[in-house]
């Protein structure tokens, strides 16, 4: 008795975070024996879509010509071979930006900060939101989510950093969102350049670059330090 068919690989191109109105392609890669591919979306009737394989049959393409709220969500894919259906792929979370107006990102007291001092990045939305994400350019993931404890709506979230080092220098953006769908984000804020001066650690890197360490920093969240903000939001480290 053969074991279960290996799970396929699922990914989105050009990426999994897509602006409203832009196109996205979802790829499901299985084996050369695949006869059919199926894409399921969480909380939607299954199958969400079916596709015949592309030659040489080891993958299928699912095209979304224009990203909207309806396409945001969590997907899995399967393939069918002569011996049956495969295991499900690992999930793909497709996020849409542009669902809400962009928040404003500022630095208090200033975006020019001396190494060793404190700075707070403040993300403010025009309408009340319950989730805020801080993104650093050249980071693979959000630095952190701040999410309200009990669904309380907030106009802002604070991201304190103390003490600041050269690692904190760089370009930041923030997003806001409603908790009912973390697959829908606002437009990104305008970028904020945080410049760290007077570093004691040696030469400061270019402000738009992360500092390299053995751990591969550009894939690792950069954790702002300090106390939990007073806004009633709770930290969710990514």
């Amino acid at each position: 008795q053969a074991g279960p068919l290996p799970k396929p690989t699922l990914w989105a191109e050009p990426g999994s975070v897509i602006s409203w109105g832009n196109s996205v392609t979802i790829w499901c890669q299985g084996t050369l024996e695949a006869r059919e591919y199926r894409l399921d979306k969480e909380e939607s009737p299954a199958p969400w879509d079916r596709q015949n394989p592309l030659e040489p049959k080891n993958k299928a393409r699912f095209s979304i010509p224009s990203m909207t709220e309806d396409y945001a969500g969590r997907y899995r894919c399967y393939y069918r071979s002569p011996v049956g259906w495969s295991q499900p792929s690992d999930p793909l979370e497709l996020v849409m930006t542009g669902a809400y107006s962009k928040p404003t990102l500022s630095a208090l007291p200033s975006p020019l900060v001396t190494s060793g001092k404190s700075v707070t990045l403040l993300c403010q939305s025009r309408s009340p939101m319950d989730t805020f994400l801080l993104i650093k350019e050249r980071a693979a993931h959000p630095l952190l989510h701040l999410r309200s404890e009990h669904g309380a709506q907030q106009h802002q979230a604070e991201f304190p950093m103390s003490p600041v080092t050269s690692v904190h220098g760089g370009t930041y953006r923030c997003f806001s969102s409603h908790g009912f769908s973390h697959y829908l984000l606002s437009h990104p804020s305008d970028p904020l350049e945080l410049i760290v001066s007077g570093s004691l650690e040696g030469p400061r890197p270019s402000p738009t670059r992360s500092v390299s360490t053995a751990a591969g920093p550009e894939d690792q969240p950069l954790m702002p330090t300090g106390s939990v903000p007073h806004s009633g939001l709770r930290r969710h480290w990514e």
């Epitope: 191109e13 050009p14 990426g15 999994s16 975070v17 109105g21 196109s23 890669q29 550009e218």
Partner: antibody, heavy 121, light 107 residues
Framework: QVQLQESGPGLVKPSETLSLTCTVS????????WSWIRQPPGKGLEWIGY???????NYKPSLKSRVTISVDTSKNQFSLKLTSVTAADTAVYYC???????????????WGQGTLVTVSS | DIQMTQSPSSLSASVGDRVTITCRAS??????LAWYQQKPGKVPKLLIY???TLQSGVPSRFSGSGSGTDFTLTISSLQPEDVATYYC?????????FGQGTKLEIK
Amino acid sequence: QVQLQESGPGLVKPSETLSLTCTVSGGSISSHYWSWIRQPPGKGLEWIGYIYYNGGTNYKPSLKSRVTISVDTSKNQFSLKLTSVTAADTAVYYCAGRRYYYDSSGYLDYWGQGTLVTVSS
Amino acid sequence: DIQMTQSPSSLSASVGDRVTITCRASQGISNYLAWYQQKPGKVPKLLIYAASTLQSGVPSRFSGSGSGTDFTLTISSLQPEDVATYYCQKYNSAPWTFGQGTKLEIK
């Protein structure tokens, strides 16, 4: 700062297999797309294919039957194999990468220095 | 598959001139277009992504515009160090494709 370095033989015989490896340093390979691009002498850039960090691949259709790109996350490397080479495959071969998530895109902002591979008997 | 066509294939301009290079996609690609600069004997360098976003460290005399099928790279005031071949590349969905290149020279 992420750096990419190609390695492999500079001379390959016709009908044999061209094998190149790209080593990624200064960061983890486990994020986003890693590509191979080539440039024949005096000509333009030609995209060969990419591998997504989870193993998903896409290749240029005209090369698909001869190309395999694979990734070894434990060694922070990805590799190119091109079978049945001819003189037309003589080119500078570049590895390149795009590693980010939240401005999720496939453009290439990390490049290796390139390695010239000559196909000749 | 989507084809990318650049024009002109070569051009010669004077220092200080405004230079425009165009790239046309055979089908719509949203704003998923990048521009690269390759100086003679050097590795290609990313200039612009998402059609109009300037890569960090690239001089502000470079700009990009367009969406859908028609895109433009503009150098507002040509400098001697801008002598290079410029390539557009689409990355909305595989196969990624480069334009054939535009060779820029100084008069």
